[in-house]
Amino acid sequence: SGRGEAETRECIYYNANWELERTNQSGLERCEGEQDKRLHCYASWRNSSGTIELVKKGCWLDDFNCYDRQECVATEENPQVYFCCCEGNFCNERFTHLPEAGGPEVTYEPPPTAPT
């Protein structure tokens, strides 16, 4: 049973490699998948000496380890690329590193959008 499932239809999109891959750099992504399959949002980033370098954000295909995650939280200790996934529209806007060894929790907020 899929109780408490938050349906994901749209995610924040970002691609640091947008020029080479000929995509947009940032925006929103409408998630598309097969019928009856769940969809998620994800974020991936690097942490170089405390400087956060966003790699990619977007939609993520049905993945059991993403089920019922309302927030995007990476738990790996010190990977080359941090990864988190979550369920719910735009749930990857903010992302957090909460290392399993009990280090400090670090949440990354998107920069405020300039007023138009």
């Epitope: 089920y67 996934c85 399993e100």
Partner: antibody, heavy 118, light 110 residues
Amino acid sequence: EVQLLESGGGLVQPGGSLRLSCAASGFTFRNYAMAWVRQAPGKGLEWVSGISVTGGSTFYTDSVKGRFTVSRDNSRNTLYLQMNSLRAEDTAVYYCAKVYYTSFFDYWGQGTLVTVSS
Amino acid sequence: QTVVTQEPSFSVSPGGTVTLTCGFNSGSVSTSYYPSWYQQTPGQAPRTLIYNTNTRSSGVPDRFSGSILGNKAALTITGAQADDESDYYCVLWMGSGIWVFGGGTKLTVL
């Protein structure tokens, strides 16, 4: 070091019940989905059940639906499989497994044997 | 009902190369099924070899590789060794909370 230790197996009569436990250590249990996989004597592996990080989503193979219930206690770092109305064909070694991103089983326990016989 | 098929048995000479395959009755296997491969010797728990089609699990020698070949997932062992003699299982993630195991391949190294 990641460790998964199953317990609770044994001999039970057809129609009886057992509760299997899987004690997890070496990782933050609440951060990972979990699964049960079984192997009948001389047969292949068969996925039995899966449970999401919160326990809010549970899934079963058709042959155990309505008889088995998977649950987890994140405060005790323990996964459970309640097995009711057991049948001879449920005889197997039951493994618990940790689920990682891209939905694969990255760590396995050593298994506990369930024998259903009169 | 989805059935995942593997060769029941296979033999390879020491130092040889063997490719085990994993298909299913409902169409082509693609990377979206996140195919993974497990090795099991009698009386032991399974060991994870390959996940997400072609990523080796930590500690797995590079003699083992995963791929998609045509409409199937594949596990290739190059330079087979005596201790590769085991049962090999593929698993497909069907989504919506469901996994399906293949029937397994018994590999003999002789």
